[in-house]
């Protein structure tokens, strides 16, 4: 028996997790905070000049397992970390750029230490 007021229609999963967002804020975000039913993330990647840029925000539950898996992309240096343990947990994440592969040394001296 259904409880009084309970609907049989499917309901959207509530957005329960709040995350810090930076360079990746939806239009409805307030004070650089977004809400999600999935994960918070922080990502670091290099732009075309070789400058490291950090972005952070919310990932929806759908597909976030794949997005949070830090699969290497050829010729692109990036790293992502995800969390769900508490609100704004991603402000404590600190992804770092992966080390350069030997083949990247052909890009010239600016691309390695």
């Amino acid at each position: 028996k259904k409880e009084d007021g309970e609907s049989t229609a499917p309901t959207a999963r509530p957005k329960v997790l709040r995350c810090k967002c930076h360079h990746h804020c939806p239009e409805d975000s307030v004070n650089n905070i977004c809400s999600t039913d999935g994960y918070c993330f922080t990502m670091i990647e290099e732009d075309d000049s070789g400058t490291p840029v950090v972005t952070s925000g919310c990932l929806g539950l759908e597909g976030s397992d794949f997005q949070c898996r830090d699969t290497p992309i050829p010729h692109q240096r990036r790293s992502i970390e995800c969390c769900t343990e508490r609100n704004e947990c991603n402000k404590d994440l600190h992804p770092t750029l992966p080390p350069l592969k030997d083949r990247d040394f052909v890009d010239g001296p600016i691309h390695h230490k």
Epitope: K20, H22, T42, I44, D47, D48, S49, G50, T51, P52, V53, V54, S56, K91, D92, L93, H94, T96, L97, G108, P109, I110, H111, H112, K113
Partner: antibody, heavy 119, light 107 residues
Framework: QIQLVQSGPELKKPGETVKISCKAS????????MNWVKQAPGKGLKWMGW????????AYADDFKGRFAFSLETSASTAYLQINNFKNEDTATYFC????????????WGTGTTVTVSS | SFVMTQTPKFLLVSAGDRVTITCKAS??????VAWYQQKPGQSPKLLIY???NRYTGVPDRFTGSGYGTDFTFTISTVQAEDLAVYFC?????????FGSGTKLEIK
């Protein structure tokens, strides 16, 4: 020894263009990044961006996109900062600063160039 | 952009005193914080990089510590020539941002 020597002070009218030079000596220009940092009178330091001295690709902080341009003359071991359409708020001392590759602290700083707006 | 909140703004100390300056980052910076000294009329000079590494030629009275969001810079025994403004800087992500500075004055 390693030095970054910048061009002398400039007095500019609003709307004019200024080009500041930064000559590197004691090391090879193309093996380190070259950054530009602004210091307004009595104020703190603001990173403007940098130029990848190997590829020549510049990157600008958001506040310095548009009127500002970084360039290189590698044969002369010199980096340049050009400010177009000079404005009152551009009055400042500008520093070039070297960074090790893929490190973003600045281990050698230029002598500084003060650019002032003339009324 | 990431904010580096530096305190205090001013310090008035006597030669021989111990001085501590703090910087609080708005996000986890790991070890990616540097400290600079700028004497009056001069360019900044790098003192500390990666939070705790003393740059070449920097006297050992200058030390840095911290990780994540809280960083500390210490001068163990202040000398007259330490009169300067000190800045922290995060070098983790573009745009690389500086603290507002701490002006150290000697009594």
């Amino acid at each position: 020894q390693i030095q970054l020597v910048q061009s002398g002070p400039e007095l500019k009218k609003p709307g004019e263009t200024v080009k500041i030079s930064c000559k590197a000596s004691g090391y090879t220009l193309t093996t380190y990044g070259m950054n530009w940092v602004k210091q307004a009178p009595g104020k703190g330091l603001k990173w403007m961006g940098w130029i990848n001295t190997y590829s020549g690709v510049p990157a600008y902080a958001d506040d310095f996109k548009g009127r500002f341009a970084f360039s290189l003359e590698t044969s002369a071991s010199t980096a340049y900062l050009q400010i177009n359409n000079f404005k009152n708020e551009d009055t400042a001392t500008y520093f070039c600063a070297r960074s090790e590759l893929r490190n973003w602290y600045f281990d050698v700083w230029g002598t500084g160039t003060t650019v002032t707006v003339s009324s | 952009s990431f904010v580096m909140t530096q305190t205090p703004k001013f310090l008035l100390v006597s030669a021989g005193d111990r001085v501590t300056i703090t910087c609080k980052a708005s996000q986890n910076m790991g070890h990616n914080v540097a400290w600079y000294q700028q004497k009056p009329g001069q360019s900044p000079k790098l003192l500390i990089y990666y939070a705790s590494n003393r740059y070449t030629g920097v006297p050992d009275r200058f030390t840095g510590s911290g990780y994540g969001t809280d960083f500390t810079f210490t001068i163990s025994t202040v000398q007259a020539e330490d009169l300067a403004v000190y800045f922290c800087q995060q070098d983790y992500s573009s745009p690389f941002t500086f603290g507002s500075g701490t002006k150290l004055e000697i009594k």
